[in-house]
Amino acid sequence: SHTLPVHFLQPSDIQKIVEELQSLSKMLLKDVKEDKGVLVSQNYTLPCLTPDAQPPNIIHSPAIRAYLKTIRQLDNKSVIDEIIEHLDKLIFQDAPETNISVPTDTHECKRFILTISQQFSECMDLALKSLTSGAQQATT
């Protein structure tokens, strides 16, 4: 019988989830960048890779989810719904909530959205690189 502990998501699934997130992050960034004249800010930092970066906890999924949920509330980007669904595949059901302080100024909101979207896209590139290099090491 196949009753393995499903804590162990198959590596192929983790890879596919991260690939999907990478693709969706590019779509989000492209969408956000259509708002011209907005610059990235140094005031916001999206947590990215976990210290040990071990699958499935390769990225800070709960924190990333909270940031993206905040963007969804500030700006109705429907691609975020799909991003959240994929992040939920990597989030343990008892993971603590992350509180995000939201900027109130309209222009600052736009900077927040651009900055986090850009960092998210870069984070997914890093995560995929980390996964593929880890997979190569495992086969050598």
Partner: antibody
Framework: QVQLVQSGAEVKKPGSSVKVSCKAS????????MQWVRQAPGQGLEWMGA????????RYSQKFKGRVTITADKSTSTAYMELSSLRSEDTAVYYC???????????????WGQGTTVTVSS | AIQMTQSPSSLSASVGDRVTITCRAS??????LAWYQQKPGKVPKLLIY???TSASGVPSRFSGSRSGTDYTLTISSLQPEDVATYYC?????????FGGGTKVEIK
């Protein structure tokens, strides 16, 4: 053991609305997606939508968009599915379902409500 | 939306026969697939989740497998109590669509 108890059978007139409830007990998880599914007489299972009760986040089937509203009351651990502008084709058994497993996202629905029969007839 | 094509829509087999039901996803959904059994007038019951993990209390004659975007539910030795309709459902991204169902009868 998770238990889902749904509200009783309803008979409704075409054009009206119905609100079905689903009370969950016996679980501790906070991050989960609960789904609503319906089954017309002699037909297959049809996905209607889902809710993430911790945030009230919802997803709907394109077929029901604009007619269905899924909500949740965290204080009573109860989810609701409201379907408006009812027509005879909406006569069906409506189910809520709840997942088990370590992740927020489901990969199967382990627990199902007993079903609520909704009959739409003039 | 991801389509789930289930086949056959119905089958008739003898007690003790090996029965296979297939669901094909319209795109790669990884292992995010579940199988349910629904007996007439009853609530659906989860048999298999994450493509090949047996749900608690499910008899060992039921198993799930995957090859690419094709998913198979196998009943290794059909029993009279297995008369039911079987459904697959994917959980890759919403809408979490179901296959059309397979009605299993005893010859």
């Amino acid at each position: 053991q998770v238990q889902l108890v749904q509200s009783g059978a309803e008979v409704k007139k075409p054009g009206s609305s119905v609100k079905v409830s689903c009370k969950a007990s016996g679980y501790t998880r906070t991050r989960y997606w609960m789904q609503w599914v319906r089954q017309a007489p002699g037909q297959g299972l049809e996905w209607m939508g889902a809710i993430y009760p911790a945030e009230g986040d919802t997803r709907y089937s394109q077929k029901f968009k604009g007619r269905v509203t899924i909500t949740a009351d965290k204080s009573t651990s109860t989810a609701y599915m409201e379907l408006s502008s009812l027509r005879s084709e909406d006569t069906a058994v409506y189910y809520c379902a709840f997942p088990e497993g370590p992740y927020a996202a489901p990969y199967g629905m382990h627990y199902w409500g007993q079903g609520t029969t909704v009959t739409v007839s003039s | 939306a991801i389509q789930m094509t289930q086949s056959p829509s119905s089958l008739s087999a003898s007690v003790g026969d090996r029965v296979t039901i297939t669901c094909r996803a319209s795109r790669n959904i990884g292992n995010y697939l579940a199988w349910y059994q629904q007996k007439p007038g009853k609530v659906p019951k989860l048999l298999i989740y994450y493509a090949k993990t047996s749900a608690s209390g499910v008899p060992s004659r039921f198993s799930g497998s995957r090859s690419g975007t094709d998913y198979t539910l196998t009943i290794s030795s059909l029993q009279p109590e297995d008369v039911a309709t079987y459904y697959c459902q994917h959980f890759w991204s919403t809408p979490w669509t179901f296959g059309g169902g397979t009605k299993v009868e005893i010859k």
